[in-house]
Structure formats: C-alpha cells, structure tokens
Amino acid sequence: IFPLAFFIYVPMNEQIVIGRLDEDIILPSSFERGSEVVIHWKYQDSYKVHSYYKGSDHLESQDPRYANRTSLFYNEIQNGNASLFFRRVSLLDEGIYTCYVGTAIQVITNKVVLKVGVFLTPVMKYEKRNTNSFLICSVLSVYPRPIITWKMDNTPISENNMEETGSLDSFSINSPLNITGSNSSYECTIENSLLKQTWTGRWTMKDGLHKMQSEHVSLSCQPVNDYFSPNQDFKVTWSRMKSGTFSVLAYYLSSSQNTIINESRFSWNKELINQSDFSMNLMDLNLSDSGEYLCNISSDEYTLLTIHTVHVEPSQETASHN
C-alpha cells in the first residue's frame, strides 16, 4: 500500500510532490490562520486550477481539465490549511502549481512541483523460440524510463537489450535475455527511481528429473527469503510447457488462500503451503508428461520462476509390450 503522495521539501516556498498515475494526491499549502481567506491554485502560473473566496469555491473560470478533480479541505481552511486534494493524476498534470493565499493580514505564495510516476507491475516470462530459450523482463507501462539490470549467478551482466515503445504518457519496455543451454540462475531488476520502487524477477533451473511411466514426481518450489514476504499478497502458478506454450496446472492466491487445480493428477500439500513451500506432486506419470514445469511466485515486488525438466520413460512392462 502506497501513500497518497510523498513530499520532498526544498528551499524557500517550494515543495516537490510525487504522485502515481490515476491515483489521488494532495498538493500541500499552509498559511497563518486569518479572516476573509482567498485561495487561488494555478498551474504553470496560467491555468486556473481552483479558486476559493468569500467562504466558498468559485470554479466558473476553472480550466476544464481540472473539472470535478479538485477540492480543498474546507473544515481546515480556518486553521491555515490551503492544501489541494487532486483526483486521478495523469502525466499531463506534471508541472509547477502555485498556491496564492491572501487574508486581511497576510499574503503568501507556495510553489508545488508535481511529478507523476507510473509503474504497472512488471513480469518475467520464460519463452522458447525455435531452439532458443529466452527470459523476458517486461513492464507494460512505466514512467520515467526505468533502470533495468540483469545478473547471472549474482554477477551483473552487461548484455542488456531493451525494446522500448513510448505511448502518449508512458513507456512499455521488454528486456529479453537469451539463456539457451544455460543452467545458471538469472535475476532481472527494474527500478523506477522517481517512485523509489523496485521489482525483481528471479529464474532458477533445477536439475532434470528422470521418471518411469506410472510413477509420481515431486517438484520443489520454495521462495527465496530475500524477496519473499508472506504477509504480502502473492500468487503461485504451476504450468507445463507443451509445444511451446504453457498450460496452467494449478494456482494458489495468498489473499484468499484459494487453490485451483486444473489437472486431477496434481496435488499440493496444504501444510507445506502454510509454511510457504509450494512444491507439488504429479501422480501416475505418462509419456506425454515429459517437458518443462514452471513454478511462478509473483507479487507486486517480485516474480520468482523455478523450472524443472521432467523426462518420463516407458516402464519395462510398456517396453516389453511394444
């Protein structure tokens, strides 16, 4: 949960407020209490954002872009609060706001610099393209341009392709990494410096497992303590790669503690789940169960991917029948 906005104090009568796209913020302004208060909020010294005098709002000349988006803290004006409550900020709202407050004994102006950030939760995807394997870190909407870093086995790597598309008010970014033939662990970090928000994606390849038909397999999936916080909402998904696409076997939502299972042979141990262990069992294996199994643990702050390769071989009986 993030605050409505956060303030950075700078010298004299100027403050910086950082807000998030589509969220509400407060532009702060205070004065010594006084009578006959006049308040004018303006954008870039030109556009009228909000006017208050003679005890009420006067919005006849308000710029249309602020219609139904602004209000004051009316019960607190008499106590010296001229702050503006600003609804659903957009990137077009970025800029300098000036608050003029006049009373019978005092005149002050406060400048507020509004910066707006966007950080829609990124994702880490594992893809197969022909014979190549790729990890892709992507974020659908981010502003300003984020810092993306990759690590292999905890060592930073310089190879960092970034596919960027800019829309009217934010960037969409993909950063693919070719991991063909590698069994190293990989980590991708996306940082929004304005919102001071960091997301991490981690990918781990487990040793291949060889099983006989009709046996069962246990696949481990335990989050790394560095990232995992059990009191934060997260989702766990187990999928199986079939002909280049993943099909979901089961998923678990921490918020509702619901488990949804799409494959009757799949089982989860409730007690282990309560201990944040999302290892699964797949019973009665058949040849078509061979492939890659992906455990995805995701929250707003991280994605942890664990991949298992399972080889199912015919049992002796099956082989002799053939």
Partner: antibody
C-alpha cells in the same frame, strides 16, 4: 499606533545597489505581510512584491523579479528591499505598506534618485 | 494579470457635490477591490476594501460599490479636504494592480 518608518531620500549611482529599510512599530511585525509599492509619474502605483516576516515567504510581481529582493529582520521589526543594477528607470518613490491583500498602513515613502 | 483602468484622470467638482469615481477590471474580480486616497505630499491611505467595506476611521461620506468588473467610489458631499488622487486596486490575486488614479479637483 501602527507606524512604518522609511528614510526620506536615497541618492545612488547607476549600476549600484540600494537597500531601503522600513521599520515597523505599534503592532506584531511577524503577523502581517509587508508590501512594497513603486510610484512614478508615468506609471502611477505599481505593486512590486510582498514578504511575510513570519516565515519569510515572498511573492514578487514578475516585472520586478531580479530587480528587487525582499527580506525581513524580525529582531528589529524591519523589512528591507534591495534594488540592484540601478538605472534612471528606477528613480521613483518607494513605499512599504502593511497588510494582507489590501494595504492598511503605509510608510512615508523613500525617494530614490539614480544619477551619476 | 488583472489590469485596473480608471477612465477619468481628472474630475472637477464643487464643495457639497456628490461625485463618483469609476474603475474597471480587465476580468471578474468578484468584489475584491480597494480604494486609496493620496493627498499631495502624503502617502496613500486606505478608504475601502472588498468593494464596499469602509476602513476604520474613514468618513461615511465615502461609499464603495460594484462587483465583477465595474466599481465606483462615491463621495456624497465633497469637502475641501477631499482634494486628492484616488486609486483603485484589485486585491483578488497577485500581481496586485492599481488603477492609474483619478485626481479630484475642487472648482
């Protein structure tokens, strides 16, 4: 009785700076904004800017930004206006005036003459 | 900026007359207008604020009226001591603007 005392005259050379004082008495200096107003025969009265001594918050008329700098000294209940890079255009009567958005008490004015 | 215009630079009147000094704002200022009187050799004195509120100690011969963009200062019965320059000022928003002034002359 509220009073604002200003020096009567200042004679300064072009290019120099001058700091005009305004000493307040008879009221709580830090509670009221102090404004500065320029009077010339051609332009009449022009509001230059204001300072609120309580927190030294300043507001300027864009026309005088960079020309005038307002300060206040609470310990001596005195407001100051410094004018820089003076030219003959700056020759005028300068008033300090107490108040919020209207000015209820005025100083007697300082006649500034910029001449070599 | 909200500019104030006083159309009459001079007004000539006689003692005992009723005189009206007008002032126009370049945009709506509600009733946020003040009037000042400046006698020769003196600093300005506040007469009226919020268009019609008399400042402490101001004679009730002075009355202010108007709202929006048009404002009037009326002196009901002019006295010799009213010989002065009269300025209007918008106190709606900064930068505050004064009108150019109207000089009241006694015939």
């Amino acid at each position: 009785q509220e009073q604002l005392q200003q020096p009567g005259t200042e004679l300064v050379k072009p290019g120099a700076s001058v700091k005009i004082s305004c000493k307040a008495s008879g009221y709580t200096f830090s509670s009221y904004s102090m404004h500065w107003v320029k009077l010339t025969p051609g332009q009449g009265l022009e509001w230059m800017g204001t300072i609120y001594p309580g927190n030294e918050n300043t507001s300027y008329n864009q026309k005088f930004k960079g020309k005038a700098t307002l300060t206040a000294d609470k310990s001596s209940s005195t407001a100051y206006m410094q004018l820089s890079s003076l030219t003959s255009e700056d020759s005028a009567v300068y008033y300090c005036a107490r108040g919020g958005y209207y000015f209820d008490y005025w100083g007697q004015g300082t006649t500034l003459t910029v001449s070599s | 900026d909200i500019v104030m215009t006083q159309s009459h630079k001079f007004l000539s009147t006689s003692v005992g007359d009723r005189v009206s000094i007008t002032c126009k704002a370049s945009q709506d200022v509600s009733t946020a207008v003040a009037w000042y009187q400046q006698k020769p050799g003196q600093s300005p004195k506040l007469l009226i604020y919020w268009a019609s509120t008399r400042h402490t100690g101001v004679s009730d011969r002075f009355t202010g009226s108007g709202s929006g963009t048009d404002f009037t200062l009326t002196i009901s019965s002019v006295q010799a001591e009213d010989l002065a320059l009269y300025y209007c000022q918008q106190h709606f928003d900064i930068p505050y603007w004064f009108g150019g002034g109207t000089k009241l002359e006694i015939k």
